[in-house]
């Protein structure tokens, strides 16, 4: 059973998925297309220095279940949405950040003496 | 099971266009890619485009971009591929394939086209 | 594009013999994500379209009988007919489907003393 807020991935297709890519590109892909036995994806995340940075490209089925479900990661800020339902699909994505919680401007890392 | 029917043979004029087909049965045909390829005699074959009949999404060889253009009428499970400005170039055999992951695992009989006055 | 040849162009074996064709391509098939090798091989008798023999390199193709072996990684291929019959006279064709325009190799026309 689904928990709720827990988004599930969409259901696998019976054939290749063509998806765009931008800097998720494999080395195989041609006019930045990949091809895939899994799910198109757009994520969205934070750089280094704090700037978003949107990624897009292929997931292969084998472990993608979990990747598309998107589970929170602590000090982490990153948005992935997932999709099969036509080619390309995941041009029309737009995750978005989450909100920053007070908590990650006061937790820094644990200094250890 | 599977079949992918086509004409046999079409004669066509210099400078016309042409309008070939291919009829699924026997699968769900919004279920699999579907492909044409191009063979003259002894030169091989030559892959000319795929479409996914269930968006109608197309991928061409940037060779036949110009040449050729594919498009499905899923009510009758056909395929569809135009060839535009004939030349005797295009004098050839050309099939229909089926394909899930990229390699095709059922081909029509092939028509062939021969483009002459 | 991503060439694809083969060898020989043609060669003539006696039934029961065994026959070796080569194809061989521009670059690596060899997918890193799954470790697959994106080749096919077709047979084209005379006056028929062709057939699918093999795929992800090795794969029989169901119906295929077990004489027909198909090897090799990377950019070298091998089919293989362990004991030829009369009735495997033909064209064989290898085709990649790692990047497209997917591409075809010239064929090795099997003749039958």
């Known amino acids: 059973k689904k928990e709720d807020g827990e988004s599930t991935a969409p259901t696998p297709r019976p054939k290749v998925l063509r998806c765009k890519c931008h800097h998720h590109c494999p080395e195989d892909s041609v006019n930045n297309i990949c091809s895939t036995d899994g799910y198109c994806f757009t994520m969205i995340e934070e750089d280094d220095s704090g700037l978003p940075v949107v990624t897009s490209g292929c997931l292969g089925l084998e472990g993608s279940d979990f990747q598309c479900r998107d589970t929170p990661i602590p000090h982490q800020r990153r948005s992935i949405e997932c999709c099969t339902e036509r080619n390309e699909c995941n041009k029309d994505l737009h995750p978005t950040l989450p909100p920053l919680k007070n908590r990650d401007f006061v937790d820094g890392p644990i200094h250890h003496r | 099971q599977v079949q992918l029917q086509q004409p046999g043979a079409e004669l066509v004029m210099p400078g016309a266009s042409v309008k070939l087909s291919c009829k699924a049965s026997?699968?769900?045909?919004?279920?699999?890619?579907m492909h044409w390829v191009k063979q003259r005699p002894g030169q091989g074959l030559e892959w000319i485009g795929e479409i996914d009949p269930s968006d109608v999404y197309t991928t061409y060889n940037q060779k036949f971009k110009d040449k050729a253009t594919l498009t499905v009428d899923k009510s009758s499970s056909t395929a569809y591929m135009q060839l535009i400005n004939l030349t005797s170039e295009d004098s050839a055999v050309y099939y229909c394939?089926?394909?899930?992951?990229?390699?095709?695992?059922?081909w029509g009989q092939g028509t062939a086209l021969t483009v002459s006055s | 594009d991503i060439v694809m040849t083969q060898s020989p162009s043609s060669l003539a074996m006696s039934v029961g013999q065994k026959v070796t064709m080569s194809c061989k391509s521009s670059q690596s098939l060899l997918k890193s994500n799954n470790q697959k090798n994106y080749l096919a091989w077709y047979q084209q008798k005379p006056g028929q379209s062709p057939k699918l023999l093999v795929y992800?390199?090795?794969t029989r193709e169901s119906g295929v009988p077990d004489r027909f072996i198909g090897s090799g990684s990377g950019t070298d291929f091998t089919l293989t007919i362990s004991s030829v019959q009369a009735e495997d006279l033909a064209d064989y064709f290898c085709?990649?489907?790692?990047?497209?325009?997917?591409?075809f190799g010239g064929g090795t026309k099997l003749e039958i003393k």
């Open positions: 992800f390199a090795s």
């Open positions: 026997g699968y769900t045909f919004t279920n699999y890619w």
């Open positions: 085709q990649q489907y790692y990047s497209t325009p997917w591409t």
């Open positions: 394939a089926r394909s899930g992951w990229d390699y095709f695992d059922y």
